[in-house]
């Protein structure tokens, strides 16, 4: 039977009808509506927006729309006791203070409740001491400082530039180095593109602009006080001392004007090489402390933020499936913003809104998807993916049994150059096939497919004629679904042509200047890139929810497993002597990958041939596809990271934003030459190879014929 017959709908209600209903003008209108005031998590304004979205989704035609609330730990500056950093002289007098707020953008001077820049979850404190410049505060930056330059950060306040890695990793690294405070700043080298004006005349970061953000190291835990369980009315909460992932030292972010005042006085060691120099007119000396004339001056932090258990609200909309209502395809993105959220998240939320409207229009005309579609507007993503994680914890039993796929919908744009997709290998073919059917919005590609422009502008490093698709890392709401629950996940957005700056975000990220006007004037005046992203995200959801056979290709997993096994083997082979001494073998892993490849190939053949009119066999084959991602979950989780349970992928231990393959083995091998007990260290490598090999083999067997 055709897809249309299976879902008892008229032929016009196909993917084309859904895509044709999506309108750029609507996305523009929704973005404007969502960005006129701040929608900080835990505030009345964000609760009101949740109720507005609930009401509108009902009007659009969803079967039900509910608010799901949780009481989670959030963090706010003290309104009467602002956070700032000072340079103090030998008498303790403050001779310079960093700014208390960002200069407001034109037209927004009288908006109230703009939260000043702060590092969410910073503890209170007023440390003072000498400054050490630590570049990006990456693991390798601290190696350079401590091992090569013999600079001790213990008892120092460190200043690090934003970019390259998640800010929480920077803070963790600084803590481990013994620092007593962290100053984060945006260097123009990372947040000011040459030849572009600063806001409001362009999309670059002005010197007074500051990136907000949380500095947690949750490792997938969700609410710091209720790890593993929902923060509901009867929750047992940990004491603050036992909370997960909180930083132990004060942290505060500043812009580059203020950073210049701190960095221009730096003395001590010169920067080790040019990669430590940004674009400010300062020497980028590492320190510790200030140079000659200023050597008696110190830096003092004044941090008075408070952590508060606060109510948050997710909006959950349901469009019931006609044939398999117990199979869930989820489209989710967050609603809370640091300030106006012009890009993050409302460029994504506006797209979700239009996708819901289009699905609702089809439903009002008598159509239903084959499977149930759940739509989610998550709260408190900016405070550690809290809304999505609490909801998934509350519904984990349903999700692990019924979850087909999760499509994430945060910012639709971070540039306007080409498409960017991160997803499970199971979705590669879905994404390829879909983008071949969509028109490219790019200049110079009129009449060409999105696949063609994407492949041209962002080619795969391995496969000629194909586009790059990246691994899923974290730092967004797919984390709990993919890394903890093993639900096939993907994300798509339009991005910049800036591969070297992959994890630094766009210049105005998390600043007060992320406004509607930023998008409408500089990024996407015609909203054509937003529309394309809506078509990709919506098209993926449509196919996942409506195709008779799930659009997953397990053979693509086989290909990447071999690639990842080769990669981790080559890392290990940098230590050939130790491999020999401790009898380290990857044979079991390569054998498991080989078995997976053969079984996946046979499964794909059966998938072509089986009788799709037999609902029991159809359901059986689809369940094997749905549960394949689940089969990569290790119930025990990764070492010291129990909520990262996917054996093939995890967020990098050194950068939450980046995905790492075979993370258990990778972490066991990392810096192994410096371990005090090599025998124990190599024993852990062997254990991780065993876990990986077993998991790949076990996953392969889920694809075998059932009897």
């Amino acid at each position: 039977k055709s897809s249309n017959e299976a879902t008892n709908i008229t032929p016009k209600h196909n993917m084309k009808a859904f895509l044709d209903e999506l309108k750029a003008e609507n996305i523009k209108k929704f973005l404007y509506n969502f960005t006129q005031i701040p929608h900080l998590a835990g505030t009345e304004q964000n609760f009101q927006l949740a109720k507005q979205i609930q009401s509108q989704w009902k009007e659009f035609g969803l079967d039900s729309v509910e608010l799901a609330h949780y009481d989670v730990l959030l963090s706010y500056p003290n309104k009467t006791h602002p956070n700032y950093i000072s340079i103090i002289n030998e008498d303790g007098n403050e001779i310079f203070n960093t700014s208390l707020f960002e200069p407001p953008p034109p037209g927004y001077e009288n908006v109230s409740d703009i939260v000043p820049p702060f590092s969410a979850f910073s503890p209170q404190g007023m440390p003072e001491g000498d400054l050490v410049y630590v570049n990006y505060a990456r693991t390798e930056d601290f190696f350079k400082l401590e091992r090569d330059m013999k600079i001790n950060c213990s008892g120092k306040i460190v200043i690090a530039r934003y970019g390259k890695v998640f800010r929480g990793n920077k803070v963790k690294n600084a803590q481990l180095a013994g620092a007593k405070g962290v100053i984060l700043y945006s260097d123009p080298a990372d947040y000011f593109a040459p030849g572009v004006k600063s806001y409001p005349d362009g999309w670059n970061l002005p010197g007074g602009g500051v990136q907000r953000g949380n500095i947690l190291n949750l490792n997938g835990a969700g609410d710091p006080l209720t790890p593993g369980y929902p923060a509901n009315e009867y929750a047992y909460r940990r004491g603050i001392a036992e909370a997960v992932g909180l930083p132990s030292i004060p942290v505060h972010p500043i812009g580059y004007y203020d950073a210049q005042k701190l960095l221009e006085k730096m003395g001590g060691s010169a920067p080790p090489d040019s990669s430590w120099r940004g674009s400010l007119k300062v020497p980028y000396n590492v320190g510790p402390g200030f140079t000659g004339n200023f050597s008696t001056q110190k830096v003092k932090m004044h941090i008075h933020s408070t952590n508060e258990v606060t109510r948050i609200y997710n909006v959950i909309g349901t469009l019931r499936g006609a044939v398999e209502p117990d199979r869930y395809v989820i489209l989710g993105g967050h609603r809370d913003s640091w300030v106006f959220g012009g890009i993050d998240p409302q460029s994504g939320a506006a797209v979700v809104h239009e996708i819901v409207r289009s699905f609702g229009t089809l439903k009002k005309e008598g159509w239903r998807p084959r499977r149930t579609i759940l739509f989610a507007s998550w709260d408190a993503e900016e405070f550690g993916l809290l809304g999505s994680t609490e909801w998934a914890e509350e519904n984990s039993r349903l999700l692990q049994e019924r979850g087909v796929a999760y499509i994430n919908a945060d910012s639709s744009i971070e540039g306007n150059y080409t498409l960017r997709v991160d997803c499970t290998p199971l979705m590669y073919s879905l994404v390829h096939n879909l983008t071949k059917e969509l028109k490219s919005p790019d200049e110079g590609f009129e009449g060409k497919s999105l696949y063609e422009s994407w492949t041209k502008k962002s080619p795969s490093p391995e496969f000629s004629g194909m586009p790059r698709i990246s691994k899923l890392g974290s730092g967004n709401d797919f984390e709990v679904f993919f890394q903890r629950l093993g639900i096939a996940s993907g994300r798509a957005r339009y991005t910049k042509n800036w591969e070297t700056n992959k994890f630094s975000g766009y210049p105005l990220y998390h600043s007060v200047y992320e406004t509607y006007e930023l998008v409408e004037k500089f990024y996407d005046p015609m909203f054509k890139y937003h529309l394309t992203v809506a078509q990709v995200r919506g098209g993926m959801v449509f196919e996942l929810a409506n195709s008779i056979v799930l659009p997953f290709d397990c053979r693509d997993y086989a290909v990447v497993l071999r690639k990842y096994a080769d990669k981790i083997y080559s890392i290990s082979m940098k230590h050939p002597q130790e491999m020999k001494t401790y009898s380290v073998s990857f044979d079991s892993l390569f054998s498991a990958v080989k078995n997976f490849t053969e079984i996946a190939s046979k499964f794909s053949e059966r998938l072509q041939d089986f009788d799709k009119s037999n609902p029991i066999v159809l359901r059986m084959m689809n369940d094997q596809l749905m549960f394949l991602e689940r089969a990569f979950i290790d119930p025990l989780g990764l070492p010291d990271r129990p909520f990262y349970r996917h054996v093939i992928y995890a967020p990098s231990s050194h950068n939450k934003y980046a995905g790492e393959s075979f993370p258990g083995i990778y972490d066991a091998l990392f810096d192994i030459e410096s371990k005090v007990d090599p025998s124990k260290a190599w024993g852990e490598v062997k254990r991780q190879i065993y876990v990986a090999a077993f998991t790949v083999q076990a996953a392969a067997e889920t694809l075998s014929e059932v009897a």
Epitope: S99, F101, P104, P105, G208, K281
Partner: antibody, heavy 122, light 108 residues
Framework: QVQLQESGGDVVQPGRSLRLSCAAS????????LHWVRQAPGRGLEWVTL????????YYADSVKGRFTISRDNSKNTLYLQMNSLRAEDTAVYYC???????????????WGQGTTVTVSS | SYELTQPPSVSVAPGQTARITCGGN??????VHWYQQKPGQAPVLVVY???DRPSGIPERFSGTNSGNTATLTISRAEAGDEADYYC???????????FGGGTKLTVL
């Protein structure tokens, strides 16, 4: 259009006080650092004081430190200069000026008022 | 404290190029701004950040800065360019704005 308008200049006796005001219009006042610069008759420009856009930093020339106080009211789009213990050498035209960007230190002053005259004489 | 030294006067024939210097210790490491002031008027910013021009300022005005000298160059000088010119920097050692003594430009 972008404008600064000083007022409050007067003839005062040495040792007395005076408060100058500078009313701003045509730009986002709370987003810019501001300066007072003076010019004695027949002399060059002399910087007097600055204030950051949020009021968190104030710096003064040595010649006025302890006697003059700069302040701003962002809700009224107005900059002030409170001048105490005035001396004959404070006689000058006083200009207020805004910086090209929010930072009041390293950047130029792109908008100036027409000035207000302060004469200190017995 | 930091000092900026300018020649008291510079003369130039109409249509020729005038160069006004501003000397200061390692001034090349600082951002230099230049102002034009005509008699009885407020100063006007003509060059900022060493070499950038505000909108409305003719391309004839340009600036350079390196070593111990910053220079304001006015090409194809006109009678209307007659004015006092001041250079200015921020001195981070003293946390003071510093102006040069000014240069009177005469277009002969």
């Amino acid at each position: 259009q972008v404008q600064l308008q000083e007022s409050g200049g007067d003839v005062v006796q040495p040792g007395r006080s005076l408060r100058l005001s500078c009313a701003a219009s045509g730009f986002s006042f709370s987003g810019y650092g501001l300066h007072w610069v003076r010019q004695a008759p027949g002399r060059g420009l002399e910087w007097v004081t600055l204030i950051s856009y949020d009021g968190s930093n104030k710096y003064y020339a040595d010649s006025v430190k302890g006697r003059f106080t700069i302040s701003r009211d962002n809700s009224k789009n107005t900059l002030y200069l409170q001048m105490n213990s005035l001396r004959a050498e404070d006689t000058a035209v006083y200009y207020c000026a805004k910086t090209t960007v929010s930072d009041p230190y390293y950047y130029g002053m792109d908008v100036w008022g027409q000035g207000t005259t302060v004469t200190v004489s017995s | 404290s930091y000092e900026l030294t300018q020649p008291p006067s510079v003369s130039v024939a109409p249509g020729q190029t005038a160069r006004i210097t501003c000397g200061g210790n390692n001034i090349g490491s600082k951002s230099v701004h230049w102002y034009q002031q005509k008699p009885g008027q407020a100063p006007v910013l003509v060059v900022y950040d060493d070499s950038d021009r505000p909108s409305g300022i003719p391309e004839r005005f340009s600036g350079t800065n390196s070593g111990n000298t910053a220079t304001l160059t006015i090409s194809r000088a006109e009678a209307g360019d007659e004015a006092d010119y001041y250079c200015q920097v921020w001195d981070s050692s003293s946390d003071h704005v510093v102006f040069g003594g000014g240069t009177k430009l005469t277009v002969l």
